[in-house]
């Protein structure tokens, strides 16, 4: 994405599904700042690297970052 | 299916105010950025406005910008553009799109409203 | 701004016929452009996304390609509803969303 996080919220739209975790190249959880006043979830997308903005709030999207991190704590030692 | 219904539109005189709706369904609104377009009479694409999902950010295009202003009501499904001090180059069909990305890089305008027409004249 | 130039600003063609319209920007927008389709007295139509995703229910028949500066539209075979203005749109450097000033495809 060109502009970087300091400007504005990265995310203009949002979408409450979920996404399949073994799709996922990357997931960042940006927190509130002075320039978004709300918790960011971008879902990088291993297929051409598409971004995919999710709904924090989503039953759905609260449980995907339950299993990725578990999925995390499974392979830390 | 995906419906986006523009309503307000008229002839006004230069200097007045006008406020468009556009009623929105087939989606959930409340997760999506919307956009203003307008086209004057024989003429291309102008973009004059974005609103993110949440409201928090506005984004307007500098021939509009202070005279223009976008909002939503995210319980009415409905986004709003008031336009003030109108001039004669106002005059053009408004559209309302949805924004098919989530960045605003990504992605395009994927669904558009039928358009509605500002006349500005004395 | 970025200013987006589309060329040829009219274009005769035959159904049946390949159809290729060009979109330069006056600096690199990466590959955020989108081309749209639009019919007299109807709104646009999101043809292509990311210069080269098809939207949902575009013919295979069109095709984007290109990157940085310049973009091409494609229509491999010209069927008869397909005539009409095609604008492509910067998304790289917002605001403004910026549109090229369009290509007519008319009926030879």
């Known amino acids: 994405i060109p502009l970087s996080r300091t400007v504005r919220c990265t995310c203009i739209s949002i979408s409450n599904q979920p996404v399949n975790p073994r799709s996922l190249e990357k997931l960042e959880i940006i927190p509130p700042s002075q320039f978004c006043p709300h918790v960011e979830i971008i879902a990088t997308m291993k297929k051409k690297g598409e971004k995919r903005c999710l709904n924090p709030e989503s039953k759905a999207i609260k449980n995907l970052l339950k299993a990725v991190s578990k999925e995390r704590s499974k392979r830390s030692p | 299916q995906v419906q986006l219904v523009e309503s307000g539109g008229g002839v006004v005189q230069p200097g007045r105010s006008l406020r468009l709706s556009c009623a929105a369904s087939?989606?959930?609104?409340?997760?999506?950025?919307m956009h203003w377009v307008r086209q004057a009479p024989g003429k291309g694409l102008e973009w004059v406005a974005l609103?993110?999902?949440?409201?928090?950010?506005?984004y307007y295009a500098d021939s509009v910008k202070g005279r223009f202003t976008i909002s939503r009501d995210n319980s009415k499904n409905t986004l709003y553009l008031q336009m003030n001090s109108l001039r004669a180059e106002d005059t053009a069909v408004y559209y309302c799109a949805r924004e098919g990305g989530y960045t605003g890089y990504d992605g395009g305008f994927d669904y558009w409203g039928q358009g509605i027409l500002v006349t500005v004249s004395s | 701004e970025i200013v987006l130039t589309q060329s040829p600003a009219t274009l005769s063609l035959s159904p049946g016929e390949r159809a290729t319209l060009s979109c330069r920007a006056s600096?690199?927008?990466?590959?955020?452009l989108a081309w749209y389709q639009q019919k007299p007295g109807q709104a646009p139509r999101l043809l292509i996304y990311d210069a080269s995703n098809r939207a949902t229910g575009i013919p295979a028949r069109f095709s984007g390609s290109g990157s940085g500066t310049d973009f091409t539209l494609t229509i491999s075979s010209l069927e008869p509803e397909d005539f009409a203005v095609y604008y492509c749109q910067q998304r790289s450097n917002w605001p403004p969303y910026t549109f090229g000033q369009g290509t007519k495809l008319e009926i030879k």
């Open positions: 087939g989606f959930t609104f409340s997760n999506s950025a």
């Open positions: 609103i993110p999902f949440d409201g928090y950010n506005k």
């Open positions: 600096q690199s927008v990466s590959s955020y």
